[in-house]
């Protein structure tokens, strides 16, 4: 504790200018005071001034009024500081002395003489109100008042309660008259060191380090930290718990990055072709006659079907074609010959057979040659017989189509649907996508093939400790423990002081 006993001297009267021994002062009693403050004694005795002592300079001669003075020599009220708990009781001895010597330091002068003394014993509570008193004896009268107040930063009825107002990391408060803390606006707690967060800030998902703030814990966002953040890899999805990826309509896959409506979103098929949401790229274009290419972007040449026979060359025209025939041939497709076997029309060892009584002929070609005159080496791949990007390969007299993944058939014309095997359990909807089938599961099921019944999820075993809330996460094997204040760990198994709850993915 710490406080000050204050004594205000008001008036001293010694009309006859007499000393205590009956002698008179010459030329008058030049008066100073000695004050001794000590613990309560029923009978005042000499001895140390246990609570403190103080002397004044000469304040006047014989009778005088003592003015208040706040500093320097002759300060009034007199100050007797103490640094202990005020006991509520005291003994006070006030002595008036005459000095023939120095006005300012009369204590040091020889020949000082006692004029009078008073002794006060009693109780005194700490407070701002002055207690006024007057003491008389046969020769003198003294008017005075006194009180006990606490030093700065000390409070309470015995000045034992220390309170220093502060506004820093350790607290934000002012001091009440009784020494209790009064928190500054926006702060709370025993030491006013806990900020009051933004009104409505989510109790578990948010916290604050200063008033009217709402800082979100990992996985949460927004003004009040009541919106979750989707998974890092999520593209076209949302969440109902942190790090989830629940696909927007028309999107599939673990990270909602596979377009289930590619045809609608991108219209990739050209020239009036039909688009279907299947195939290795998420769509397939079925071309109208006369068009080809992955997106049906290529118009087929009218000559593409090789309509000109007997070595005739084909020329594209606006809506048809024209055959330029070699010598000896005529007709729209150079199908008529003016030659006979006598003209040796068969090349590459072909045998000539006369027809129509020698007016025409037919060539029988050896293996690997073809054409009306056996003029063409057989390349069974020239007609691009392999569909859907299949690779044509000549194998002697025959050819084979090497199909891309997802296609089959002699000409790779058949699309193998991953969904044909009905891989989705429990009524899941199957979508053929580039990396295999994707299942959209009905409510209550999850997993790549909708094979997991959510009611028997990872939370069923109660993996979270200490009253934590359990959520299922991105896959059936994942769960999230949202820890209560004071616990951390993937299962909220570790007690800890700070920081409070974080969601953990196990």
């Amino acid at each position: 504790g710490s406080g000050i006993f204050q004594l205000r001297l008001q008036e001293f009267v010694n009309q006859r200018g007499m000393l205590a021994n009956g002698q008179s002062c010459e030329p008058g009693c030049r008066t100073f005071f000695r004050i001794c403050l000590k613990h309560f004694q029923a009978t005042f005795s000499e001895g140390p001034c246990t609570f403190g002592n103080v002397s004044t300079p000469v304040l006047g001669t014989n009778s005088f009024v003592v003015r208040d003075k706040n500093s320097g020599s002759g300060r009034n009220p007199l100050q007797l500081p103490f640094n202990f708990t005020w006991p509520g009781t005291f003994s006070l001895n006030i002595q008036a002395w005459h000095t023939p010597g120095d006005d300012l330091r009369p204590e040091t002068s020889p020949g000082n003489s006692l004029i009078s003394q008073i002794i006060i014993q009693g109780s005194l509570a700490v407070g701002k109100i002055w207690r006024t008193d007057e003491q008389n004896d046969t020769l003198t009268r003294l008017s005075y008042s006194y009180r006990v107040i606490c030093s700065d930063n000390y409070y309470g009825e015995s000045c034992s309660r220390l309170c220093k107002k502060r506004d820093d990391h350790f607290g934000h408060y002012e001091c009440q008259p009784d020494g209790s803390l009064s928190c500054l606006p926006g702060w709370t707690g025993k030491y006013c060191d806990q900020p009051i967060c933004l009104s409505g800030c989510h109790e578990q998902n948010g916290y604050c380090s200063k008033p009217d703030e709402c800082i979100c814990r990992p996985g949460w966002q927004g003004r009040l930290c009541n919106e979750c953040i989707p998974h890092n890899g999520c593209r076209h999805g949302t969440c109902s718990i942190p790090w989830q990826c629940a696909c927007d309509e028309g999107w599939g896959g673990l990270f909602c990055d596979q377009d289930l409506n590619y045809c609608t979103h991108h219209s990739p098929c050209k020239n009036g072709s039909t688009c279907s949401n299947s195939g290795p790229k998420g769509y397939t274009c079925t071309c109208l006659p006369g068009y080809t290419g992955e997106h049906c972007e290529l118009g087929l040449s009218k000559c593409a079907s090789n309509p000109c026979r007997n070595g005739g060359s084909c020329k594209d025209q606006e809506n048809s074609y024209h055959c330029l025939c070699p010598p000896g041939y005529y007709g729209q497709h150079c199908e008529h010959s003016t030659l006979t076997c006598a003209d040796s029309p068969c090349f590459n060892g072909g045998s000539c057979r006369e027809r129509n009584q020698g007016s025409s002929y037919a060539c029988e070609c050896p293996p690997n040659f073809t054409g009306s005159n056996c003029e063409k080496k057989v390349d069974r791949c020239t007609s691009n017989p392999c569909a859907n990007g299949g690779q044509c390969q000549n194998r002697g007299p025959s050819r084979t189509c090497r199909c891309r993944p997802g296609f089959t058939g002699t000409h790779c014309e058949l699309h193998i649907s991953d969904c044909a095997r009905s891989p989705c359990a429990h009524g899941g909807t199957c979508h053929d996508l580039e990396n295999g089938p994707v299942c959209t599961c009905p409510a209550g099921f999850s997993g790549r093939r909708c094979e997991v019944r959510i009611t028997h999820d990872a939370c069923a075993s109660g993996p979270c400790f200490n009253g934590a809330t359990c959520y299922t996460g991105l896959s059936p094997n994942n769960f999230v423990c949202n820890c209560p204040y004071g616990f951390v760990g993937s299962r909220c198994e570790f007690p800890v002081g700070l920081p409070p709850s974080f969601p953990w993915v196990a």
Partner: antibody, heavy 118, light 107 residues
Framework: EVQLVESGGGLVQPGGSLRLSCAAS????????MSWVRQAPGKGLEWVAS????????TIGDSVKGRFTISRDNAKNSLYLQMNSLRAEDTAVYYC???????????WGQGTLVTVSS | DIQMTQSPSSLSASVGDRVTITCRAS??????LAWYQQKPGKSPKLLIF???VLADGVPSRFSGSGSGTDSTLTISSLQPEDFATYYC?????????FGQGTKLEIK
Amino acid sequence: EVQLVESGGGLVQPGGSLRLSCAASGFTFGNFPMSWVRQAPGKGLEWVASISSSDSWATIGDSVKGRFTISRDNAKNSLYLQMNSLRAEDTAVYYCARGYYNSPFAFWGQGTLVTVSS
Amino acid sequence: DIQMTQSPSSLSASVGDRVTITCRASQEIYRNLAWYQQKPGKSPKLLIFDTSVLADGVPSRFSGSGSGTDSTLTISSLQPEDFATYYCQQYTYYPPTFGQGTKLEIK
């Protein structure tokens, strides 16, 4: 494919203003919180600001608070950073990133250079 | 603010080497740590989040581990394309803070 493309950087005098933009594609922009992160020449990375997805709640770093504001337009798939009262120490490459102040920054733009000099 | 201290600041290694980079937080960050790779003139790329989860498309030679205040990024067998600067980042406490970076150079 997720793409973030920043624009609006350039040379500006101290005390001047600049507005950076970030065009997003390849994901549903309105579903995700977004941030700005900067990198002074030859230095490390510093988080600048974040904005939530649906209520567009802005959180600004102390070093730029009162001078910079972050905003978004979900209809335009765009993120913005309004920079006022620019100082020499704001000189940096500013990156637009998908993520919040309490999450990893999963995707980043190529960056736009802001130079504050007289 | 939480201080993130990476060590070493720079590192020379050869193709095929096993490399370890450490990141220390000034207080416990509860596994909320990410690692990024940045090549000169390019933007950072997320490698690892939640201390040990590999980001989409990141080769399996990268791995992360740690608990409490200390975290580690390991590259099991260095490839030519791995020479870059690596940053760690904590996202437990506001504001998020990054390490000063570790420059991985060819020996």
